[in-house]
Interface confidence: medium
């Protein structure tokens, strides 16, 4: 999906309003120094591409993030403010339902969410600099 035509201000507001709180809750008890930030992004659409990938694409050691509250809110936000986004996700959602796994918060998942926090911050700082 091409995130170029999203309403970035509205996405920023949704992140600051609710998604950030859920991410912080998820990361509670860990420190940024516990993980190395290895993922970055260069502009707003690129940041959203990376955020979508880390949030919704299962990895071998972290398969369950898409069921978390911050992921659900992220999905709703992207569907609301990115034209045509929800249509592109129908097949992906159906495939995910077939792969449902036991929910376990692993260290790898914490690392992934730590990366997400960094990407969201980058997204907003990029947004501020463009105004």
């Amino acid at each position: 999906y091409d995130f170029t035509n999203c309403d970035f201000q509205k996405i920023e507001a949704d992140y600051l309003r609710t998604i950030s709180k859920d991410l912080i809750t998820y990361m509670s008890g860990t420190k940024s120094t516990d993980f190395n930030n290895t993922v970055s992004c260069s502009n707003r659409p690129h940041c959203l591409t990376e955020i979508q990938s880390l949030t919704f694409n299962p990895t071998p050691r972290c398969a369950s993030l898409a069921k978390e509250m911050f992921a659900r809110k992220t999905k709703a936000t992207l569907a609301l403010w990115c034209p045509g986004y929800s249509e592109t996700q129908i097949n992906a959602t159906q495939a995910m339902k077939k792969r449902r796994k036991r929910k376990v918060t692993t260290n790898k998942c914490l690392e992934q969410v730590s990366q997400l926090l960094g990407l969201w911050r980058r997204f907003i700082r990029t947004l501020l600099k463009k105004q």
């Epitope: 609710t18 912080i24 940024s32 501020l128 600099k129 105004q131």
Partner: nanobody, 127 residues
Framework: EVQLVESGGGLVQAGGSLRLSCAAS??????????IGWFRQAPGKEREGVSC????????YYTDSVKGRFTISSDNAKNTVSLQMNSLKPEDTAVYYC??????????????????WGQGTLVTVSS
Amino acid sequence: EVQLVESGGGLVQAGGSLRLSCAASGFTFADYDYDIGWFRQAPGKEREGVSCISNRDGSTYYTDSVKGRFTISSDNAKNTVSLQMNSLKPEDTAVYYCAVEIHCDDYGVENFDFDPWGQGTLVTVSS
């Protein structure tokens, strides 16, 4: 549970001082270098950003109307952020909220439509 609790509000005469405090529970300000700030909402008015502090480097930012009168500071050991308010004016009357992860920088205090994490603390400045 992740929570922010604001305290320190009250009734004060114009020219007086108050110190607001924001205490976090369920997470630690220093853990992820969160940006933390204060917002206020006066009756019948829109919420506005007042001040914020970046835990990355301690940078502080203020909206123009409070510059030179308000001072924000953080105490990571106590997991609190304080707002020292001096030379208070009647127009400072509002409910004050603190918020986290707000991304303050040279562009000023990011003013956004957030759901307050805490109940806020009421500051009333009489003339």
